[in-house]
Amino acid sequence: KIDTPQRGSIQDINHRVWVLQDQTLIAVPRKDRMSPVTIALISCRHVETLEKDRGNPIYLGLNGLNLCLMCAKVGDQPTLQLKEKDIMDLYNQPEPVKSFLFYHSQSGRNSTFESVAFPGWFIAVSSEGGCPLILTQELGKANTTDFGLTMLF
């Protein structure tokens, strides 16, 4: 079979959705006439070469936009960035492209996304809202790292 990315929508526990603003992902309260991004995600084909029991390693992109989430250090700080990249190009690579990979863990309806390149750093949004998505090590404090992921079929 041909592997293709799955599509999904994401919101956090405060019912904020991800929207694209000036090539940056931000979390905002859902409103009428707003178009949240649709997430594209696909599991890494080299799962056996990655850490066990940390979650399912996935590439995360924005559906139809050729943009993927990646983690890179700016100075000493791991940061979350959007890069122009075809998610299938990442999927087909001969090795895991760790800067673009996230361990997806599910507990009940909650999902977390941990950077493979920077273990212990998670995709998060500030509790204030209207802020860009970030990477954080601080779980359950000023930042929200739990998201609701709904797959679209």
Epitope: T49, K85, Q93, P94, E95, K98, S99, A117
Partner: antibody, heavy 121, light 109 residues
Framework: QVQLVQSGAEVKKPGASVKVSCKAS????????IHWVRQAPGQGLEWIGR????????RYDPKFQGRATITTDTSTSTVYLEFSSLRSEDTAVYYC??????????????WGQGTLVTVSS | QAVVTQEPSLTVSPGGTVTLTCRSS?????????ANWVQEKPGQLFAGLIG???DRAPGVPARFSGSLLGGKAALTISGAQPEDEAIYFC?????????FGGGTKLTVL
């Protein structure tokens, strides 16, 4: 600058084992994959296997599975290849190489200077 | 397991163009083989030239280009320089392992 410096030449008897080292500098070894490749006299290159130093997971060419063991010590940025049950046909120069993702693809961009392993009774 | 074959030797005139190829015994080479090309010059370390079939490694001169040609991976040197005299190895990816070719000795004469 990026460098991979390998240990010195070895002479071994058939049936023995050898352990070759590859010390990385100028980059974070955890951000890349380190491969081992060998070249027998007058022959082409032969891929042995690779390690992900950040995690320690390995892959091997089926031909070498069971005889080659690749390990890493991230505290010293060193990768090791241990080769067991040596035969005369294992006489070769053994190279470590970095497979690095840059832009859109992986490249075997930097290589060690090679370690000559001679197997002779 | 696939065998990867290269021309044993080729000669090019300075300023000329030459194409080295890399054939797989298991069929046509495709972009899914992520062809890499590596250069070995006498007395120097191996150096990566091309990855992912046609991407140049950082710092590699534009006269080196990678492509697919008639079901083979190809490395073309346009405007060959004396310093391009070397042995060139290709490597192809097959699902879970790499296979290298036997190398092409290029003479610039």
């Amino acid at each position: 600058q990026v460098q991979l410096v390998q240990s010195g030449a070895e002479v071994k008897k058939p049936g023995a084992s050898v352990k070759v080292s590859c010390k990385a500098s100028g980059f974070n070894i955890k951000d890349t994959y380190i491969h081992w490749v060998r070249q027998a006299p007058g022959q082409g290159l032969e891929w042995i296997g690779r390690i992900d130093p950040a995690i320690g997971t390995t892959r091997y060419d089926p031909k070498f599975q069971g005889r080659a063991t690749i390990t890493t010590d991230t505290s010293t940025s060193t990768v090791y290849l241990e080769f067991s049950s040596l035969r005369s046909e294992d006489t070769a120069v053994y190279y470590c190489a970095r497979l690095h993702y840059f832009g859109n693809n992986f490249f075997f961009d930097y290589w060690g200077q090679g370690t000559l392993v001679t197997v002779s009774s | 397991q696939a065998v990867v074959t290269q021309e044993p030797s080729l000669t090019v005139s300075p300023g000329g163009t030459v194409t080295l190829t890399c054939r797989s015994s298991s069929g046509a080479v495709t972009t899914s083989n992520y062809a890499n090309w590596v250069q070995e010059k006498p007395g120097q370390l191996f150096a990566g030239l091309i990855g992912g079939t046609n991407d140049r490694a950082p710092g590699v001169p534009a006269r080196f280009s990678g492509s697919l040609l008639g079901g083979k991976a190809a490395l073309t040197i346009s405007g060959a320089q004396p310093e391009d005299e070397a042995i060139y190895f290709c490597a192809l990816w097959f699902s879970n392992h790499w296979v290298f070719g036997g190398g092409t000795k290029l003479t610039v004469l």
